[in-house]
Amino acid sequence: MMTGTIETTGNISAEKGGSIILQCHLSSTTAQVTQVNWEQQDQLLAICNADLGWHISPSFKDRVAPGPGLGLTLQSLTVNDTGEYFCIYHTYPDGTYTGRIFLEVLESSVAEHGARFQIP
């Protein structure tokens, strides 16, 4: 029985060239987290394995930093980083939980004028 829920930062925005923290939190379950995968659409960004620690995909090594916690920090953002990000929690005995975050990367001038997503 899967009783847990994933809380995420929802829809977020950041400036081009800046950085952003992607954060998910699994609550309402006593299941053991065995691994968290971070994906952008169908591309694997990083894995945090309870046994082995962090693995960052080679193609993202320069721009992705592990943490804080089970979160992920994206650096040197470009407009192409706009899109959906998924945190996939593998747990035992519950199974797999998935959270979704939408990131919009804005040109600096746009960001300065307060165009922001509202977190629902």
Partner: antibody, heavy 119, light 107 residues
């Protein structure tokens, strides 16, 4: 080349014990979650046990919990399955399998070792 | 436990045909479904994971689709080497469970 070779199967009486081994090569064994999966004589596939890369976490279905123990020796790149209190329904071909780093599926399987539980 | 129902249990088709195998989960499994191929006298081999992602080295005539509880494996332009039994497996929740298999034969 990724290779996994199982051994230790055989004929055992109900209530008996058996220890299966799986010798792995061609990959960094300690980086991968490993499992045992069995295939019954009717060709049904059943997940039996899983162990994390460093062996810190083990997982079992209720059907074998308390009777089977999965373990690994990363220095020897070997996976084990200790089976006790064996029942006739444990009769199957036992495969060791490697999980993708992402956990999404088992990407390589060994050739299997046959276990028959019969009086 | 999540039950995985595969259909048909056996299938006969001609070379060059396009065939579809379906797998139905007893509850929502998102996209956490894999497909395996087991040729006669051989071991299971991973074809597709995450419902539609082709595993390395698998020919592009194999494709997977679906999410939630309904999934399909499609083989286009059937080849003699595709003679096998195909299994689906859910990775949504423990215990991981497999479908009963679909045995594919050539007419």
């Amino acid at each position: 080349e990724v290779m996994m070779v199982e051994s230790g199967g055989g004929l055992v009486k109900p209530g008996g014990s058996l220890k299966l081994s799986c010798a792995a090569s061609g990959f960094t064994f300690s980086s991968y979650t490993m499992s045992w999966v069995r295939q019954t004589p009717e060709k049904r596939l059943e997940w039996v046990a899983t162990i994390s890369g460093r062996g810190g976490n083990t997982y079992y279905p209720d059907s074998v919990k308390g009777r089977f123990t999965i373990s690994r020796d990363n220095a020897k790149s070997t996976l084990y399955l200790q089976m006790s209190s064996l029942r006739s329904e444990d009769t199957a071909m036992y495969y060791c399998a490697r999980w993708l780093l992402t956990y999404y599926a088992m990407d390589y399987w060994g050739q299997g070792t046959s276990v028959t539980v019969s009086s | 436990d999540i039950q995985m129902n595969q259909s048909p249990s056996s299938l006969s088709a001609s070379l060059g045909d396009t065939i579809t195998i379906t797998c139905h989960a007893s509850q929502n499994i998102n996209v956490w479904l894999s497909w395996y191929q087991q040729k006669p006298g051989n071991i299971p081999k991973l074809l597709i994971y995450k419902a539609s992602t082709l595993h390395t080295g698998v020919p592009s005539r194999f494709s997977g689709s679906g999410s939630g509880s309904g999934f399909t494996l499609t083989i286009s332009s059937l080849q003699p080497e595709d003679i096998a039994t195909y299994y689906c497996q859910q990775g949504q929740s423990y215990p991981y469970t497999f479908g009963g298999g679909t045995k594919l034969e050539i007419k």
